[in-house]
């Protein structure tokens, strides 16, 4: 009685349960009553990452330097190459097919989370008591200077873009 379903790591073909090819190998020929499934290792720069019956291996991803990409992890016969972006750039998608320059936080905004190879800079508005006077991908909001601790007084109030200006206390004459 020919099978209608096969065990794990097998597939049904011509009423036969044939072994799938292991990761890193491709199918050359299906099994028959007289022969096993024939598999061959993937070539250089190729991979297959599952038990399979593919007749062609997949090409490793190319990390194109023209798109700001570089190799984070070299591919094997069983895994694809993993790309990441050059310093100062991040991936535009999860697949990391291209890169864009990290965003800078404008004056009045500080860096909440520094960008990585896969995520952009996250900016936040500087709250009261904090400022940022530069456009930067690294600078956080800085606290206003405390004039009191320097025995000075506030001569000009701070904003989200500027620090306070301290001056000497008026002396009683």
């Amino acid at each position: 009685e020919p099978p209608t379903a096969c065990r794990e790591k097998q597939y049904l073909i011509n009423s036969q349960c044939c072994s799938l090819c292991q990761p890193g190998q491709k199918l050359v020929s299906d099994c028959t009553e007289f022969t096993e499934t024939e598999c061959l290792p993937c070539g250089e720069s190729e991979f297959l990452d599952t038990w399979n019956r593919e007749t062609h291996c997949h090409q490793h991803k190319y990390c194109d330097p023209n798109l700001g990409l570089r190799v984070q992890q070299k591919g094997t016969s069983e895994t694809d190459t993993i790309c990441t972006c050059e310093e100062g750039w991040h991936c535009t998608s999860e697949a990391c097919e291209s890169c864009v320059l990290h965003r800078s936080c404008s004056p009045g905004f500080g860096v909440k989370q520094i960008a990585t190879g896969v995520s952009d800079t996250i900016c936040e508005p500087c709250p009261v008591g904090f400022f940022s006077n530069v456009s930067s991908a690294f600078e956080k909001c800085h606290p206003w200077t405390s004039c009191e601790t320097k025995d000075l007084v506030v001569q000009q109030a701070g904003t989200n873009k500027t620090d306070v200006v301290c001056g000497p206390q008026d002396r009683l004459r």
């Epitope: 072994s19 050359v28 020929s29 028959t32 009553e33 007289f34 022969t35 096993e36 024939e38």
Partner: antibody
């Protein structure tokens, strides 16, 4: 029905080469390996090698690796075995088979 | 290489008798997938071999049920429950589990 057709006989001179044919019909050629077997007069059977017509993949008996070359022409559904540098030791019946079905065999005579 | 040893070399029987042919391999012929590709063939005089049994126990289509195969590892047996005149000829065992694939030397079934 499945058939493997082979020419009946071939006579060649020592030192020459011969290319034997095996025409398959009645099934999809690319699904089964083709096996080649040698039988000397009054002797037993000897496995030469196998070829998979779908992929061109081959397996050889080390003993025949420098003697036999297996090929396939899928367009004509024909498998071939070329034998080189022939001597009287190569005089035999050569069968092609799908294992469940066999050709009638080609009788090769090597003689000057 | 796996040596396939058949016994007896010659087996004289009376029609209607049971016949038993043994085939021993020089090493275990279970392959890496857990399968044993052991086949039995019958070759009548002037004919090509015909498949009787494959994968140790499976009767090929059209083969009478008086033929049965058994065994495992290194010991295999072909039994013919009631020998008929058409069963006479040379029987070969063949292993296709480990390359190079190899035939036994043959057992001649003849009338006593």
């Amino acid at each position: 029905q499945v058939q493997l057709q082979q020419p009946g006989a071939d006579l060649v001179k020592p030192g020459a080469s011969v290319k034997m044919s095996c025409k398959a019909s009645g099934y999809i050629l690319t699904t089964y390996w083709i096996t080649w077997v040698k039988q000397r007069p009054g002797q037993g059977l000897e496995w030469i090698g196998d070829i998979h017509p779908g992929s061109g993949s081959t397996k050889y008996n080390e003993k025949f690796k420098s003697k036999a070359t297996l090929t396939v022409d899928t367009s004509s559904s024909t498998a071939y075995m070329q034998l080189t540098r022939l001597s009287s030791e190569d005089s035999a019946v050569y069968y092609c088979a799908r294992r469940d079905y066999w050709g009638q065999g080609t009788t090769l005579t090597v003689s000057s | 290489d796996v040596l396939m040893t058949q016994s007896p070399l010659s087996l004289p029987v009376s029609l209607g008798d049971q016949a038993s042919i043994s085939c021993r391999s020089s090493q275990n012929i279970v392959n890496s997938q857990g399968n044993t590709y052991l086949e039995w063939y019958l070759q009548k005089p002037g004919e090509s071999p015909k498949l009787l049994i494959y994968k140790v126990t499976n009767r090929f289509s059209g083969v009478p049920d008086r033929f049965s195969g058994s065994g495992s590892g290194t010991d295999f047996t072909l039994k013919i429950s009631r020998v008929e005149a058409e069963d006479l000829g040379v029987y070969y065992c063949f292993q296709a589990s480990l390359v190079p694939w190899t035939f036994g030397g043959g057992t001649k079934l003849e009338i006593k």
